[in-house]
Each structure stands twice: as structure tokens, then as C-alpha cells.
């Protein structure tokens, strides 16, 4: 349906404060080192220009598409080329090829100084003074250091934040009331975050259909009572939604997000059981709730797939009319029989299927090729939780740290040449499996663990891409989507690395480290375990837990010291020196 | 947790009858795909035929179609092989299974519990 003018009909559809709101994420996502000031400055005269077009919607400009409106008002920022180099490149293009530009300049790791959380009073202050402001500065943060964050979501993210400052700012222990609540919106932020960057990584990397085929076996694991017709509306609703936030079109994405769950809720009855609750609730509340909701169970009796996939006779000839169709079907019917697998398992087994019929139905007898297609399937299920089982025995005996100290020397050792704060930052990710999905009954473990690990190995992609230093990283990343956990699970120790030499700065420490916060200070020795394999990637486990445990200890002695910093000098030198011989460096 | 205890094993002649029972304890059936395999002397474990939840689907292996019938009652907890004209070569431990998720009845890997078994031999 065309309209006039689709900037005053995004205006009227999503209201004056959602608009100005996405249009701030927008721009900030695209120019990240903006300062603030300048992002509101640029959102204010877009708003401005809205309303006169929903005024009159013939106005000048105003039948202008959003792209063009948009990027012409992020070409009029004065520093562009001083503060983004070869970006302001991208404004001589026209549009599309002027957006494509400016996505393909968002950076997963903007060298933007760490947010510091202010003292309770001063956050308080500063919320009653100007609460508007207040929330924008928090989508501008949010969005400038994560520019693929889900926009709608975002907006629900802010409203909490809110909530939490109305609710704490009034409290007698504000502080006790407004941090647990913040600290909680960051983590929950953070792992949003990270969720829709691999959405994002598999519609730009990998194409629409592959994003369309997680999307089935995800939905169908989730509405299995479902009829594949209403599942595959629903996939088609969604990769057009998450195309668009992908793509930078925040308006229409946060738009077509509210009329998607405006159907789910007013055809709940053919979708899932389990919607009820989350369709009682306001809008922002409702399309979370509805993107969270639970499996719902599944239908009292389903048949052996063997009769449709396998023994029919037109298996070949129905695979042959619709190719996506039959398969989608397949992953479909497979997906609502197994919550219990990982998504990234289901379109592996789909893949498989596939990969056999292209072959049997090309055979002469393709009935007694395909026959025993789902043998080739046991050791794709067994591989994920036979791997499953034996790391969470690990993380059951060593607990979050020590596991995640395992896990940075098994990758550290794999793949040495990725940056020490990458391969922190992923293998801390990776060892939170253990404390998320090993508590869950082993049918819950596989699609917790696997589909997290896929998130977290997307962060270790996009990070390697920006400054790829790893064949072996780039490989496992680019070849297969489904198969990128297994890619990383079967890379041995990389024996052609050199080496690095021993810098005994890099094992220097101060007492700054005695005010850090338990987190950060395991930081610090995650960092210096990490260094310590670049250096010795032969080391036993038994050298580096001596090691480590030396290193712990001394940073206990020397924080507990009158002098500290004389203690870190003197025992540090020592420290080096010691390990230096354990480790025969 | 299923445990599962099979029974009504034995010795019989060719061409004779049999039928095998499987109680349940620990959970409800009516939640698991229930399947019979079994393992011949030297032999690699085959699948004999499996019933979804509420029986309304029943599969079998082509050596045993029209000859075995599978049957459960879900307030017994109980499932059923019920094996006519039998030959020397159904000589096996047969074995009761559950599963929680089933998309392949055949396939042993998509079954959760087992039981010990319970031996048919076929003999004149």
C-alpha cells in the first residue's frame, strides 16, 4: 500500500515519541562518534520535517523515500570526514548504494570509552532534572556501541529503565532498589545485543534464506500445533522485519514488528497455547514476550516422518515441484517433533536431507539410495550432546571460572593469532554456557547450549572480520553457517604458529588492580593466562594452573600489603621470574 | 525417569503366537513414543515397530509388517507386541523403549529409556 509521503505515514502509525526515538538509534548506529548534542540536533529537524509532511503530505520533500532523507540529513554533519575518514565517501553515492555504504561502515567495536556508572544520587538528579534527556542519552549510548541493536527492542529496554528510575528514585536505599535493576538491563542488553547481531550476520552473510530456514525450525520448535501454512506466514512476516532493522530501516522495522504481533495475537488460537498473557500486555511488553515465549507442547499425536520423507513414492517427484517448499516442510515436521534439539542441529539434519535427495533422486533407484537417510543422522545428534555432556562434567567440577580459564586456553591454543581482548571477551562468553544451560534437564540443554554458542561464536566472527588475522578463524566463519560451532570444536592446536616473544611488561601489574571489581580483576588474570599461551602454547594444563595459581596468590599477598605498590614491583619481578621456569621460557 | 521391565518371553514353535508386555513406572507414558526393538545372537540391534503417543500411528520393519501388531494402554502403562506366524530368523531379546521427542520411529537414537529385555526363541 503507497502512501504520499512514508515519512508522515511512520509518523502517524508510530507516534511522535517512538519516532523521534528510532530516529535517534538510527542515526546513532550509523554515526557513532556523533556527539550527542549534534544527534538530537539532526533528530529534532527531521521531526520538524515530519510533521509538516503529515500536514500536508504534498509538502516539498516529502514524498522523498526515508533513505533519502535520512542520509541526506547525516551528510550535512559539518566533521564527517574528520571524525569517519573514507566514510564521508559514502555521501557522493546515490541511494541505495549511499545506505549500503553507511551499513557497511557500522563498527561492531567502536573505540568508544567504557560507559562508567555514575553514583545512585547523581543518575537521580540527573533523571528528575531532565528525564527526556536522561532517556535519550541512554538510547544514544545503547545504540552507538551496539549499531545492530534489535530498534524495537531498544525502545522496550528504555521503557524499563524508566520504570526503574521512577520506581528507585523514590526509594529509601535507592541504591539497593537501582542496581540489581541496571545490572540486570545490561546483561539482558548485552545478550539482545549479541542475538540480533547473528541475525543480522546470517540475512547479510549468508542470504534470506538461510535466515528464513532458522526462522522455521525455530518457530515450528515453538508453535509445533501450528499448521505449516501459518508457520511459514510467520517466517516470511519476520525476515521481512528483522531485514529491515538489519538494514537500517528502523521505521518500518518497529511498524511491521507491532502489526506482526497484532496478527499473532489475534490468531493465537491457530499459532500456540501459550500466548494468552503476553497478548494482555501493552505493545512493547507484548512483541517481547510474544519473541520469548515458551514451546508450546506438542500436538497429542504425531507419525513416524519415514512415511512422507523416506517410503513414499513421491518423495523425489515432490521434492523436484518445490524444492524450498518440500524442504521447508521437512524442517518443519522435524523442528515441532524436537524441542529438544538445537536449531543449528535441526538445519544441519535439513542440510543433510537435502544434500541426499539432490543426490538419490538423480539415481537410478532413488527409493534404495535415500532409504537409510536418517542413519546419516545419528552422529550429526550424537556429536552436539556427547559435547554437551562432557563440558558441562567440566563445568560441574571446575565451576564459571576455572571453566572459562579452560576454555582460553582451548581456544588461545586453536586460533593464537586473535587478539588477547577478543579471545577474553569470547571465551568469558563461551564459559557462561556452563552456568545457563547445565542446570537445565538434558531436553532443554542442547537448544540452550548450541544456540547460544552460535550467538557467542558470531561476536568472535564479526570481530575477526573487521581485522581478520586468522585463515583458520575466516574459514570456520564463512563456510557454513550451521556448522560454524563444529568448524571451531574440531580446529586442533595451530602448530604453524610462532610463538610471541616474552615481554615481562605484559606481566607487570600495579596495585590499581586491589580496587577493581571481582569481575574485572578475573579479567586481568584472563588476560595474563592468555598471554602466557601466546607465549607457551605447548604448556601443560598442569604448568599453566601453576602458574595461575602463583599469580593469584600474589596478587592476594600484594593487596593485603602496606606498601602495595612496592610489593607488586618486588614480587611481580619475582613472579616472572619463576614462571618464566616453570614454563622453561 | 522411565524404568522400563519387559516380560512374556519364551519358547515357541514356527508358526506360533506371542505377545510381550512393557510396564512402565516412574512417569506417564501417555508422553513417549513407545517402540520394540530387538537383537538376534551375532547380530547388530534392529527395530520390530513403535506406536505414538496415544497410539493413534503405528510403524513396523518390513520383516514383521502383518505378522506383529504394537498396542499400548496408556492408563495401564503399559505397551504391547502382540507376534503371530513366527519365524526361526524373530529368535531375539526383544527390548521396550521410550522416547521423549520422536521424529524417526526406527531410529535407537531417538529413544530416551530402555528396558533389559526379555528373549523369543523360535524353535521346532
Known amino acids: 500500500d503507497a502512501h504520499k509521503s512514508e515519512v508522515a505515514h511512520r509518523f502517524k502509525d508510530l507516534g511522535e515519541e517512538n519516532f523521534k526515538a528510532l530516529v535517534l538509534i538510527a542515526f546513532a548506529q550509523y554515526l557513532q562518534q556523533c556527539p550527542f548534542e549534534d544527534h538530537v540536533k539532526l533528530v529534532n529537524e527531521v521531526t520538524e520535517f515530519a510533521k509538516t509532511c503529515v500536514a500536508d503530505e504534498s509538502a516539498e520533500n516529502c514524498d522523498k523515500s526515508l533513505h533519502t532523507l535520512f542520509g541526506d540529513k547525516l551528510c550535512t554533519v559539518a566533521t564527517l570526514r574528520e571524525t569517519y575518514g573514507e566514510m564521508a565517501d559514502c555521501c557522493a553515492k546515490q541511494e541505495p548504494e549511499r545506505n549500503e555504504c553507511f551499513l557497511q561502515h557500522k563498527d561492531d567495536n567502536p573505540n568508544l570509552p567504557r560507559l562508567v556508572r555514575p553514583e545512585v544520587d547523581v543518575m537521580c538528579t540527573a533523571f528528575h532534572d531532565n528525564e527526556e534527556t536522561f532517556l535519550k542519552k541512554y538510547l544514544y549510548e545503547i545504540a552507538r556501541r551496539h549499531p545492530y541493536f534489535y530498534a524495537p527492542e531498544l525502545l522496550f529496554f528504555a521503557k524499563r529503565y524508566k520504570a526503574a528510575f521512577t520506581e528507585c528514585c523514590q526509594a529509601a536505599d535507592k541504591a539497593a532498589c537501582l542496581l540489581p535493576k541496571l545490572d540486570e538491563l545490561r546483561d539482558e542488553g548485552k545478550a539482545s545485543s549479541a542475538k540480533q547481531r547473528l541475525k543480522c550476520a546470517s540475512l547479510q552473510k549468508f542470504g534470506e534464506r538461510a535466515f528464513k530456514a532458522w526462522a522455521v525450525a525455530r518457530l515450528s520448535q515453538r508453535f509445533p500445533k501450528a499448521e505449516f501454512a501459518e508457520v511459514s506466514k510467520l517466517v516470511t512476516d519476520l525476515t521481512k522485519v528483522h531485514t529491515e532493522c538489519c538494514h537500517g530501516d528502523l521505521l518500518e522495522c518497529a511498524d511491521d514488528r507491532a502489526d506482526l504481533a497484532k496478527y499473532i495475537c489475534e490468531n493465537q488460537d491457530s499459532i500456540s497455547s501459550k500466548l494468552k498473557e503476553c497478548c494482555e500486555k501493552p505493545l512493547l511488553e507484548k512483541s517481547h514476550c510474544i519473541a520469548e515465549v515458551e514451546n508450546d507442547e506438542m500436538p497429542a499425536d504425531l507419525p513416524s516422518l519415514a512415511a512422507d520423507f523416506v517410503e513414499s513414492k513421491d518423495v523425489c517427484k515432490n521434492y523436484a515441484e518445490a524444492k524450498d517448499v518440500f524442504l521447508g516442510m521437512f524442517l518443519y515436521e522435524y523442528a515441532r517433533r524436537h524441542p529438544d534439539y538445537s536449531v543449528v542441529l535441526l538445519l544441519r539434519l535439513a542440510k543433510t536431507y537435502e544434500t541426499t535427495l539432490e543426490k538419490c533422486c538423480a539415481a537410478a533407484d532413488p527409493h534404495e539410495c535415500y532409504a537409510k537417510v536418517f542413519d546419516e543422522f545419528k552422529p550429526l545428534v550424537e556429536e552436539p550432546q556427547n559435547l554437551i555432556k562432557q563440558n558441562c562434567e567440566l563445568f560441574e567440577q571446575l565451576g564459571e571460572y576455572k571453566f572459562q580459564n579452560a576454555l582460553l586456553v582451548r581456544y588461545t591454543k586453536k586460533v593464537p593469532q586473535v587478539s588477547t581482548p577478543t579471545l577474553v571477551e569470547v571465551s568469558r562468553n563461551l564459559g557462561k554456557v556452563g552456568s545457563k544451560c547445565c542446570k537445565h534437564p538434558e531436553a532443554k540443554r542442547m537448544p540452550c547450549a548450541e544456540d547460544y554458542l552460535s550467538v557467542v561464536l558470531n561476536q568472535l566472527c564479526v570481530l575477526h572480520e573487521k581485522t581478520p588475522v586468522s585463515d583458520r578463524v575466516t574459514k570456520c566463519c564463512t563456510e557454513s553457517l550451521v556448522n560454524r560451532r563444529p568448524c571451531f570444536s574440531a580446529l586442533e592446536v595451530d602448530e604453524t604458529y610462532v610463538p610471541k616473544e616474552f615481554n615481562a611488561e605484559t606481566f607487570t601489574f600495579h596495585a590499581d588492580i586491589c580496587t577493581l571489581s571481582e569481575k574485572e580483576r578475573q579479567i586481568k588474570k584472563q588476560t595474563a593466562l592468555v598471554e602466557l599461551v601466546k607465549h607457551k602454547p605447548k604448556a601443560t594444563k598442569e604448568q599453566l594452573k601453576a602458574v595461575m595459581d602463583d599469580f593469584a596468590a600474589f596478587v592476594e599477598k600484594c593487596c593485603k600489603a602496606d606498601d602495595k605498590e612496592t610489593c607488586f614491583a618486588e614480587e611481580g619481578k619475582k613472579l616472572v621470574a619463576a614462571s618464566q621456569a616453570a614454563l622453561g621460557l | 525417569e522411565v524404568q522400563l521391565v519387559e516380560s512374556g518371553g519364551g519358547v515357541v514353535q514356527p508358526g506360533g503366537s506371542l505377545r510381550l508386555s512393557c510396564a512402565a513406572s516412574?512417569?506417564?507414558?501417555?508422553?513417549?513414543?513407545m517402540g520394540w526393538f530387538r537383537r538376534a545372537p551375532g547380530k547388530e540391534r534392529e527395530f520390530v515397530a513403535a506406536?505414538?503417543?496415544?497410539?493413534?500411528?503405528?510403524y513396523y520393519a518390513d520383516s514383521v509388517k502383518g505378522r506383529f501388531t504394537i498396542s499400548r494402554d496408556n492408563s495401564k502403562n503399559t505397551v504391547y507386541l502382540q507376534m503371530n506366524s513366527l519365524r526361526p530368523e524373530d529368535t531375539a531379546l526383544y527390548y521396550c523403549?521410550?522416547?521423549?521427542?520422536?521424529?524417526?520411529?526406527?531410529?535407537?537414537?531417538?529413544?530416551?529409556?530402555w528396558g533389559q529385555g526379555t528373549l523369543v526363541t523360535v524353535s521346532s
Open positions: 516412574g512417569s506417564t507414558i501417555s508422553s513417549y513414543v
Open positions: 506406536i505414538s503417543r496415544s497410539g493413534g500411528y503405528t
Open positions: 523403549a521410550a522416547g521423549r521427542y520422536s521424529a524417526w520411529y526406527s531410529q535407537s537414537y531417538e529413544y530416551d529409556y
